[in-house]
């Protein structure tokens, strides 16, 4: 059975969160997708969304968030660049399917951003444009305002992944193996 999981990413200020959400290709390929933050006791807030209909592998940038929807692979890639401490929180991907409620995708991401030096001297890689070569246009797509009341409750943590070293080694609690998350400053 599919389990709702919440994964924890611990990153330093200035680093990049680079995650993916998968969806059923046949059902949702061209549906509009969104990246939301869930704050305790509040409705999920949409931070960025793809165009409607969603375009294949066409990056959409909203501030420091870049969404890329790979229709042909059933994957939504989400990058949050130049992370700030205040970006810490619980995030999720959803698919808009009006008039029905948004469809939540796996996994939820618990992001913890801490202060700390994460770049190389003289590096300008925290600049979104320098790193990603994406035209500085924000999405023309309007993100729907409605959100699902049932996604307000928090999922119980399943495991945690701590990124604490420069070479991006992660230790998972309650898991026998180690995973790595690439961290590019």
């Amino acid at each position: 059975a599919t389990k709702l999981t919440e994964e924890k990413y611990e990153l330093k200020e200035g680093q990049t969160l680079d995650v993916k959400c998968d969806y059923t290709l046949e059902k949702f390929a061209s549906s509009q997708k969104a990246w939301q933050i869930i704050r305790d006791g509040e409705m999920p807030k949409t931070l960025a969304c793809t165009e409607r209909p969603s375009k294949n592998s066409h990056p959409v940038q909203v501030g420091r968030i870049i969404l890329e929807d790979y229709h042909d692979h059933g994957l939504l890639r989400v990058r949050m660049v130049n992370l700030q401490v205040e970006d810490s929180g619980l995030y999720q991907c959803v698919i808009y399917q009006p008039p029905k409620e948004p469809h939540m995708l796996f996994d939820r991401i618990r992001l913890v951003v801490t202060k700390g030096f994460s770049g190389t001297p003289g590096s300008n890689e925290n600049s979104t444009q320098n790193v990603y070569k994406i035209p500085p246009t924000t999405t023309k797509a309007l993100c729907p305002l409605y959100t699902s009341p049932r996604t307000v409750t928090q999922a119980p943590p399943k495991s945690t992944a701590d990124v604490s070293t420069p070479d991006s080694e992660i230790n998972l609690t309650n898991v026998t193996d180690i995973i790595r998350v690439p961290v590019f400053n």
Epitope: T2, D72, D107, A161, P182
Partner: antibody, heavy 122, light 107 residues
């Protein structure tokens, strides 16, 4: 022991289908993507696609779309790759490989099966 | 799709030599690049991930460098057991593609 064990060699006729299995052990099967990579004799590596064993969702490269199906049985920790409408050019060794953590944009393959040779011949 | 071009396609070197293999990406892939070793009749084995990080258990004579479009894989002192074909692989976007491979032989 962390490993991926694949099913044995297959000989198929053109137009037939083949289903290759990949049994995972020693790690949490649903936490990591399973990828399929093939290699024709004397040739390079060709990525076919991926599957998230937790959600069951999968994706494949354009070349294989409509011919490849990736499934899994989470209770026995097995991933399957079925390729249909086989032709002689599909003769290759098919590898399953553990990819990144399901939520992360990590596509390095740190654990591989030994490969399954599929021969397509009339 | 991003094309990965490896050079040379084959090379012959002596035990103890320093060996370099390059991989050129057709567009900027930042550090989204991995290196694999494949011995005859065996499955590939991950050596380097994210351009420069050594996989656990891999000997320190193997290293990787580069970012953007140009990458180098180095064996600091070639050993007889390093006879294999080496592949680079990017994951900057989808689809994932591999270089065509570099066959390494001992002189």
């Amino acid at each position: 022991q962390v490993q991926l064990v694949q099913s044995g060699a297959e000989v198929k006729k053109p137009g037939a289908s083949v289903k290759v299995s990949c049994k995972a052990s020693g790690y949490t099967f649903t936490r990591y993507d399973i990828n399929w990579v093939r290699q024709a004799t004397g040739q390079g590596l060709e990525w076919m696609g991926w599957m998230n064993p937790n959600s069951g969702n999968s994706g494949s490269v354009q070349k294989f779309r409509g011919r490849v199906t990736m499934t899994r049985n989470t209770s026995i920790h097995i991933a399957y790759m079925e390729l249909s409408s086989l032709r002689s050019e599909d003769t290759a060794v098919y590898y399953c490989a553990r990819g990144g953590y399901t939520s992360s944009w990590r596509w390095y393959f740190d654990l591989w099966g030994r490969g399954t040779l599929v021969t397509v011949s009339s | 799709d991003i094309q990965m071009t490896q050079s040379p396609s084959s090379l012959s070197a002596s035990v103890g030599d320093r060996v370099n293999i390059t991989c050129q990406a057709s567009q900027d892939i930042r550090k989204h690049l991995n290196w694999y070793q494949q011995k005859p009749g065996k499955a590939p084995n991950l050596l380097i991930y994210d351009a420069a990080n050594l996989e656990t258990g891999v000997p320190s004579r193997f290293s990787g460098s580069g970012s953007g479009t140009a990458f180098t894989f180095t064996i600091s002192s070639l050993q007889p057991e390093d006879i294999a074909t080496y592949y680079c692989q990017h994951y900057a976007n989808l689809p994932i593609t591999f270089g065509q491979g570099t066959r390494l032989e001992i002189k």
